[in-house]
Amino acid sequence: KESCDVQLYIKRQSEHSILAGDPFELECPVKYCANRPHVTWCKLNGTTCVKLEDRQTSWKEEKNISFFILHFEPVLPNDNGSYRCSANFQSNLIESHSTTLYVTDVKSASERPSKDEMASRPWLLY
């Protein structure tokens, strides 16, 4: 899709397996033409996406794309769940696909569950 609309490049049904206690950066890649849009993160609670107000965020600029980053320093068990970024552009709200974080409690490295073990534990989201 090549246009001057704002585009948010989060893959549909993307997933991340992360460890509680570690730092993690959740990126929202943003493409825009002229003025950088106002971007926010929210966390899904059922069908409602609750805006994350008091969380550390930052921008990372690259040549053809910018990244609006949500920082987890450190990751906490209740960071489990699905997140979405949204951009305000010319009074339009553009929403990304949601991306899901599967958080596991701290274990020794040899005991860390694999990505597939994480994917098989949907109860971790609740």
């Epitope: 893959k11 549909r12 993307s14 997933e15 991340h16 696909h97 597939d116 994917a119």
Partner: antibody, heavy 119, light 112 residues
Framework: QVQLQESGPGLVKPSGTLSLTCAAS????????MYWVRQPPGKGLEWIGR????????RYNPSFKSRATISADKSKNQASLKLSSVTAADTAVYYC????????????WGQGTLVTVSS | DIQMTQSPSSLSASVGDRVTITCRSS???????????LNWLQQKPGKAPKRLIY???KLDSGVPSRFSGSGSGTDFTLTISSLQPEDFATYYC?????????FGQGTKLEIK
Amino acid sequence: QVQLQESGPGLVKPSGTLSLTCAASGVNIKDTYMYWVRQPPGKGLEWIGRIDPANGYTRYNPSFKSRATISADKSKNQASLKLSSVTAADTAVYYCAVYDGYYESFDVWGQGTLVTVSS
Amino acid sequence: DIQMTQSPSSLSASVGDRVTITCRSSQSLLDSDGKSYLNWLQQKPGKAPKRLIYLVSKLDSGVPSRFSGSGSGTDFTLTISSLQPEDFATYYCWQGTLFPRTFGQGTKLEIK
């Protein structure tokens, strides 16, 4: 345009491991999902699993239990499938495919590789 | 797993005919984003499948306009408005809403 090229042995012994590679061109695989589907001779299509090459996160069809492993190498722009403990029932044409992870704007399949499981 | 059921399993038709293939899913394919991830594939003997339609009704690039898709929820349809000789093939529906992805059993379209 997006193209896929599969490679791997066409004959695998029972109880052995089937290994296939799928090289992509015309797209950066980190922007895609890559998946594997198989088709036994004269039968329908069966989804094996997929990978997000950007972070290595995989999803599998539970019917393959723990026998399937899908991996990706971003530097080589390719994905791989390993299927362990194969039997004659695993004889099939194996297809890799790739689709746009953001807008589903393309979905391209490889030419397929017939893998026969026989001693 | 979502079961995908196609009908008919096979179909004989003539060039110029209008043909309809149906696909029913065992549960709704409507995703949380309000879209149904239902695809149609065409497969010719000895060849790889090729996607014709995605998101129920969107035609892939280069697919002739005689192909169309419709439906919602659990019931979907592929229609070929005027069969051409190159359309004789096997057609599969498959869903991309939930894991694992699942396919219909296929509909073989043969020349009458």
